[in-house]
Interface confidence: low
């Protein structure tokens, strides 16, 4: 979410208390691996309710996504799991740790597999089938949101090279058994189902056999139905405001969301004279950020003793795992010039990122 090396904007509008998170950690994982992110508390102290966020959206725990206060595990990783992950305080949304994760060789459709699991010449004259990557078959329960792509893998070998077939709930499973079909990649020992729906729930068994024997593995798939909509912001809020120097200003933003929304107040800022990053994305600083526990949240942003530098464009942004809703609004500050402002303490400056 934030830039690799965070820059600071000093001034009232950039107040996000707390120490600056360290430089973003860059991590690379292979497809099918378990992504493991660890966020120990500073100084080895205690750790409490935290949220793990990916690309600005709170992660929903599932059989595949294991969320703990200090640790996140994403099992059977695919390319879609690449992104910016952060571990944050649950109440304040303060970033405790953040990571850039890249998952390589994980096509969403299973089309360009790299053949890493193709049967190799083991040097054994004859032999019954055996699993070549049993560590990748540990997770027998898989829960994914609807519309995701699922891939089951049973990498195996034997001599002669065994065949692989698939069963669903104990019966032969073929492409015509589901809308959208299936993709069988025999050389990669995989079954791929795109855009899964609730009717895809069930037990999937791979049967690997040659004339010397047969082995099988069963996976259970659960398809999680998505929340019906992205967050909705009440029309007309927050409203543009004009304020006198030194006055207090309060903005309201009403958010409706079936799934817990991640709500942020943001302010557009300039970095090195530029309002946008190299990719054209505007620079913003997070003023306040948290996960709302309620379906309907009336959230406020209060700016006390406003100065000229508080003027500008702000955003109320709400994100859930379906999508994002945001509303831009303006604060204009006018009046007699305020006395020279005190420098804001370093531990009160906010992180700036392109978003």
């Amino acid at each position: 979410e934030s830039l690799g090396t965070e820059q600071r904007v000093v001034g009232r509008a950039a107040e996000v208390p707390g120490p600056e998170p360290g430089q973003q950690e860059q991590l690379v994982f292979g497809s099918g691996d378990a992504v493991e992110l660890s966020c120990p508390p500073p100084g080895g102290g205690p750790m409490g309710p935290t949220v793990w966020v990916k690309d600005g959206t709170g992660l929903v725990p599932s059989e595949r996504v294991l969320v703990g206060p200090q640790r996140l595990q994403v099992l059977n990783a695919s390319h879609e799991d690449s992104g910016a992950y952060s571990c944050r305080q649950r109440l304040t949304q303060r970033v405790l740790c953040h990571f850039s994760v890249r998952v390589t060789d994980a096509p969403s459709s299973g089309d360009d597999e790299d053949g890493e699991d193709e049967a190799e010449d083991t040097g054994v004259d004859t032999g019954a089938p055996y699993w070549t990557r049993p560590e990748r078959m540990d997770k027998k329960l898989l829960a994914v949101p609807a519309a995701n792509t699922v891939r089951f893998r049973c990498p195996a070998a034997g001599n002669p090279t065994p065949s692989i077939s698939w069963l669903k709930n104990g019966r032969e499973f073929r492409g015509e058994h589901r809308i959208g079909g299936i993709k069988l990649r025999h050389q990669q020992w995989s079954l791929v189902m795109e855009s899964v729906v609730p009717s895809d729930r069930g037990n999937y068994t791979c049967v690997v056999e040659n004339k010397f024997g047969s082995i099988r593995q069963t996976y259970t798939l659960d398809v999680l139905e998505r929340s019906p909509h992205r967050p909705i912001l009440q029309a007309g809020l927050p409203a543009n405001q004009t304020a006198v120097l030194g006055s207090d200003v309060e903005f309201h933003c009403k958010v409706y969301s079936d799934a817990q929304p991640h709500i942020q107040w943001l302010k557009h800022v300039e970095v090195n004279g530029s309002k946008v990053g190299p990719d054209g994305t505007p620079y913003v600083t997070v003023l306040k950020s948290w996960i709302s526990e309620s379906v309907e949240a009336d959230v406020r942003l209060r700016l006390a003793n406003v100065s000229e530098r508080d003027g500008g464009e702000y955003l109320c942004r709400a994100t859930n795992f379906i999508g994002v809703a945001e509303k831009a609004f303006w604060l204009s500050v006018h009046g007699p010039r305020a006395a020279e402002e005190e420098l804001v303490e370093a531990d009160e400056a906010g992180s700036v990122y392109a978003g």
């Epitope: 205690p46 409490g48 303490e345």
Partner: antibody, heavy 119, light 108 residues
């Protein structure tokens, strides 16, 4: 060393107003939530609410919403709890406590302020 | 709100004995977000356990916490004279945060 130092005991009459304080030191005051906890004589602990001194965001327990007001002055590192019109039933020990780094349990406590409301 | 019920109300034991304190929640406490505090007469509470089972800094290892869901336990393996006090459980997984009514551990 993290310390929360509360203001001294108060004796008030019903209907009077009161503001008690909790001064934080030894840590970044703006970065941690401060909670207020009530303990009536001979009774257990009750969570009243929390305030984030960084931006004065407050979250009240439903039982105390409208009964008290929490505020903070980050420039002097003090959190406040105030009543506009005290009742005899407000007689209690009031503790401020800091929430830990992740915003959860109470890791440091003030020594308490005893408020006695009696006619 | 989640109601926490502690039992027994009072536990009369001798130094050296094992104390087992129970805290039962009216509904599941998410992710074991439960803490235990000790309070001695005339003093502020002190954090003992967080996350149901993790000891806070400086807490002796004779204190241990366990449990999940709705049933939690604080165990003091061998009571020392300074352990006689009132113990409170508290959940911080669901707002409003709530405390149990307390268990008093007294000298027999």
């Amino acid at each position: 060393e993290v310390q929360l130092v509360q203001s001294g005991a108060e004796v008030k009459k019903p209907g009077e107003s009161l503001k008690i304080s909790c001064k934080g030191s030894g840590y970044s005051f703006t970065s941690y939530w401060i909670a207020w906890v009530r303990q009536m004589p001979g009774k257990g602990l009750e969570w009243m609410g929390i305030i984030y001194p960084g931006d004065s965001d407050t979250r009240y327990s439903p039982s105390f919403q409208g009964q008290v007001t929490m505020s903070a002055d980050k420039s002097i590192r003090i959190a406040y709890l105030q009543w506009s019109s005290l009742k005899a039933s407000d007689t209690a020990m009031y503790y401020c406590a800091r929430l830990d780094y992740s915003g959860s349990w109470f890791d440091y406590w003030g020594q308490g302020t005893l408020v006695t409301v009696s006619s | 709100e989640i109601v926490l019920t502690q039992s027994p109300g009072t536990l009369s034991l001798s130094p050296g004995e094992r104390a087992t304190l129970s805290c039962r929640a009216s509904q599941s406490v998410s992710s074991s977000y439960l803490a235990w505090y000790q309070q001695k007469p005339g003093q502020a509470p002190r954090l003992l356990i967080y996350g149901a089972s993790s000891r806070a800094t400086g807490i002796p290892d004779r204190f241990s916490g366990s449990g999940s869901g709705t049933d939690f336990t604080l165990t003091i393996s061998r009571l020392e004279p300074e352990d006689f006090a009132v113990y409170y459980c508290q959940q911080y997984g669901s707002s409003p945060w709530t405390f149990g009514q307390g268990t008093k551990v007294e000298i027999k």
